[in-house]
Structure formats: structure tokens, C-alpha cells
Amino acid sequence: KRFHDVLGNERPSAYMREHNQLNGWSSDENDWNEKLYPVWKRGDMRWKNSWKGGRVQAVLTSDSPALVGSNITFAVNLIFPRCQKEDANGNIVYEKNCRNEAGLSADPYVYNWTAWSEDSDGENGTGQSHHNVFPDGKPFPHHPGWRRWNFIYVFHTLGQYFQKLGRCSVRVSVNTANVTLGPQLMEVTVYRRHGRAYVPIAQVKDVYVVTDQIPVFVTMFQKNDRNSSDETFLKDLPIMFDVLIHDPSHFLNYSTINYKWSFGDNTGLFVSTNHTVNHTYVLNGTFSLNLTVKAAAPGPCPPPPPPPRPSKPTPSLATTLKSYDSNTPGPAGDNPLELSRIPDENCQINRYGHFQATITIVEGILEVNIIQMTDVLMPVPWPESSLIDFVVTCQGSIPTEVCTIISDPTCEITQNTVCSPVDVDEMCLLTVRRTFNGSGTYCVNLTLGDDTSLALTSTLISVPDRDPASPLRMAN
């Protein structure tokens, strides 16, 4: 059997196989050692007994999408049946005091591979034997502690495979420079040691995406905005836009990145090299936000131009191509020497990313201030608590609720939170009355809210002792 017979139904075309060469990967035309690595079809009854105590689940994730030319990393994590885990030696053990359907196990081991390898590897001290090999016959790499790695992972995509020895979790990175744009399928088959052979325990597949568009995401934050995820913001308060470029392999680390903003409110284009920008909308309504990100990234060098006409003189070698914009044709140099590549020459290509959002601008509470605090005189001579009136003003829309969070003087340990609907006139002046149990210094956070906004103000308040001889006073 060949690898492609074992690993997947997806058969890429000859063109795909030729143009998607992955560095360090091998062709799935290679032979598969079925004696050491048996192959079971889906639904084969042997899967049921491939692992003691249940089935192992493999979870495959990637940091897709990947900008073409960058690295994409795949991670496989094995999830064992309940109460099982991998120990420091790579053996699979039962967790202490954990009950599964079979109850508590007397034997601490599910698989004691350390014992197996000591029994089975009596081969002249080289640590190499005919069974310490991958499915294509290549020997296992002898990293320190390799004997504690008891799982064999075979990754398969684009007509190629990659073999890796590992523990219950492995990562593989692939450079996407030669990968065709669009969605691709990665399949992983996992085997475990079984004496002098291997047993399949899990198969998993996942789609990853390679793109020539910079993956861009924008977070938007605005003070007093009640819900930052609903793309509704407040008039007359700045919104902070923060551009996040999905570049987990840091492919664009050394690129100059330009951000071109159109806020959709007839304020024109704004170009910046900073990933954050502030913008204030001064009108209510719906606006179309557009961002274009441009980065000069390492990319393929352009094809050489047509051969020169013999009549022309030869220019010097000094001119070498350094930069190439995907939106412009290649240079029209006509000397064959001019484009003979200097080894490892870095060509650059402009990559673009786009983000578009429709945002709604509405009225909101812009500001809230406590303008006065008054100790309310109680009708009883020795009250246990103090009533404090906070006179509050606000700007913007009419609030519908008020919340007070009373905490310790550091404003960290909340003592109580009280929220209630509030009736405010168009002047936005209201009095909030709150109870304080006992004298001392308190931190008061007061928020006014409506459907779209939440405005906060804070103050420290000193509640005096209730000595009948001492006058009532307020200290702020």
C-alpha cells in the first residue's frame, strides 16, 4: 500500500502536487509499512479495542487563515477516556481518586510503555531496531527522552505527508509559500505503540485556509458605550479603532504597514502607520467604515522578462530587482544579466487586507458628575446607618437607570451594588439616595445608563460618626 491509499480520499491533481511542495514533507506515493502500521477502515470492529477503557479523541486545530508565505501551525491534542492521563514518563495512567464506569482501578497503568520498551528493546545499545521506524521505514529521531514519546502522528495534505513522534500533544508548522490559495484539507492519523508494532487510535481532519489577503480584524472601543459588540456607538465621543492583523507566525514583523481609513461620514481618507486611530462622529445615523491595510511582505520574485533584443548594449550588473508590487507589471529590464538572481535575494510584494463594518451612531449619556453630597438628617436620635443624597448631573441623552457600587476606600472590595430605574427630566438633574452602614471612608462608583450608554463617575466619601454632640458633616 502507498500512503495515499491509507491516508485519505483527497487526491490532488498532478499540477497541485507539483506546485505545492512542502519543505520537509514526502510524497504520498511512498510505500506504507502495513505490517508495523495496520490500516483499518472506518467502521472496522477493531477500532473498538484500539484503546483500553474507551476511544481516544484527537482534536486538530490550526492558526488558519495564513497569509501565503507565512507559516501555519497545526496542533493535535489527544483526549483520553475519563480518568486517564499521560504521566511524566509518557505512560498512560489512571488519575487518582477518579471513578469511571469500571470504578477505581487497582492497576495504576493503562499503558506502561516504559516496561514494554525495557522488555522489547534488547538491541545492541544503539537504541535502533527494525520497529522503531515510521510507516515509510525512516527511523525515529533520537531526541533526548524519545523513548517517552509513544504516539506516531502522520499528517497528510496536498499529496504529501509528514511523520512525527510525540506525546499526547504535538505541533507541526508548515510554510505556505508554495501552497495554492484557498481552503485545503489536513488529515492526521495517530498510532500508539503496541509491543513491536503500532495500533491506530484516532483519525481527524480539519480545513485550513491560505490567502493572499492580510487577515484583518478591528476592535472598536468607546467610553460610555454599553455594548461594544453591537456596532452601535455614541455621538460626540471618540471611538478607538484598533487593527489586529492575524499573523501568528510574525511573517509581517519587519513590514511597513499602512492603514487607510474611510469613516463614511464625509471626513475624507485618513492614512496612518499606527494600528490604532480615534474618530468622533458628530451626527446620528448609519455609516460605512472601510479600512485597507497595505504591507510590503516577502513574496515571489517576478518572472524574468522576455529575452533582450541583441542590438542593445549591456547595462551594468548594479541594477537588481528588490521590490515588486502585485498590482504593477514586472520591470521592463532587457538585460539577461540584470535578472539573474543573486542567491537568497528577497523580493517583496504588496499584500492588502480589507475590513468593512456598518456602524450606527446614536445619542448617549456623554458625561456624569456628582455636584453635591448631603447627609440626610434622620428623625431618630441614634440611627444605625447614614443616608447620603448625591446630586448628579449628566450630559447627553436621558438616563433610565442609576447604579451605585459602594466599596472600600481603595475601590477594590465591593460592599454593595444597587441599581434602580430613575426618572430624570430633560435638564438631567437627579438626586440619588443611598444608605451607608456605619462611619468611615467609602468609594462610590455611580453609573447612569440608558439603552446604549453607561457613564461612570467615582468619588470618595467620608461618613462621620453619629455622635449626637458632633455636627453632621460631609467630607469628600
Epitope: 436621558i398 451605585t404 444597587v418 440608558d450 439603552d451
Partner: antibody
Amino acid sequence: EVQLLESGGGLVQPGGSLRLSCAASGFTFAARPMSWVRQAPGKGLEWVSSISHSGGSKYYADSVKGRFTISRDNSKNTLYLQMNSLRAEDTAVYYCARKWSTFDYWGQGTLVTVSS
Amino acid sequence: QSVLTQPPSASGTPGQRVTISCSGSSSNIGNNYVSWYQQLPGTAPKLLIYADSQRPSGVPDRFSGSKSGTSASLAISGLRSEDEADYYCGAWDSSLNAYVFGGGTKLTVL
């Protein structure tokens, strides 16, 4: 002068529906929260529901949650209470009241009788 | 069973001063304004006191409200026959997220 006028009450069978209206005048309706309060025959006052000036915030008593819906049309200066899955214990005079942290003006009420 | 507790009845003779109590908790009376409502027989309720002790215009100064901790009181001085009515206290309850009323006190002028 502030005026609140309820309508839409009447006799309805258990499980039935009714929609109450409250026409408001004499103040800026769109700037005020509004509420519904009911009073069963011979019993005390029970708050039913409240709505903010814009209609974005709504509160309901546990006894009516999921069955009653409060709404408003600021262009018509009208408050509504849609009552579904009515029960015998919903029988009461329903008052429309201005504001929600205190009820400073009340309508005269409309009687809702739920009976088979 | 009402969240706010009022005595079911109170009485007094004309000219006398009567007090109606209303007891609650920190989530209602303790941290929110108390209102008092008067309901004359066969009519809609009317706001008598708001913000613990404030009187709306048109309400005689014979009516006064006060609050201490988690209790509130309505005092009526110079009692008159026309004060015979049901009186309800009310406050927002921040734990229930609901407006709560007392069970009502029937005031009889003897």
C-alpha cells in the same frame, strides 16, 4: 394638565388575549418612562410592568413574565400592554401610570375580567 | 404576601395625628426612595409622598414622610374625615428588579 386614559379592558376567557392602551396627554410622553399597575377586586396594588422613555428598557413582575408585553408608540403618545395566556388571577383593574421609580400620575383604570 | 409590610388598618379621631409604618429591606427601602399613595374609595391611587419625604404640589403639609434604615413612615396630622382611604407605600427593589408595594393600610377616621 396631565391625563392618562386607559382602554381595551373587558371580559375574556382563560388562555385568551387582550391588548390594553393608554393615551397620554399634557406632558412630553417621549421623555418619560411609563408603567402599568393593577388591583384585583378588594385587594392591594400590584406593579405589573414598566418601560423606559425610548422603549429600550423593560421590566416585568414575575407573575406576568413571558405572558405580558409592554410597548409604546411615542409618535402616538400611547402606551400598550399586550396580555396573552390570561388566567383568572389576572382579573383586576389595570392602571396606567407615569414614570417608574414613583408613579406621579395615574389613569382611572380599565377592568379586565378573566372568566369562563 | 407583600414585600413591604404595612399594618392592615389604622384609625384616629379628627384632629389627631396618626402614623402608618412600612417595613422593608436594604434592597428596597434601604437604598431606594419610598413613595406613599392614597386611594380614596372607588378612585384611582394618587401620589402623596415621593423621594421619602417630598410632597407633590397640591398635597397638604399635614402629610409628611420619613425614612430610617429599612423602614419608612407616613404621618398625617390634623386628621380629617376626607383622609379616610387606603394608603400604600412603594419602592423599587434592586434585588427583584421590580417595583414593590406594601399590602396597604385602611385608615378609618372615627
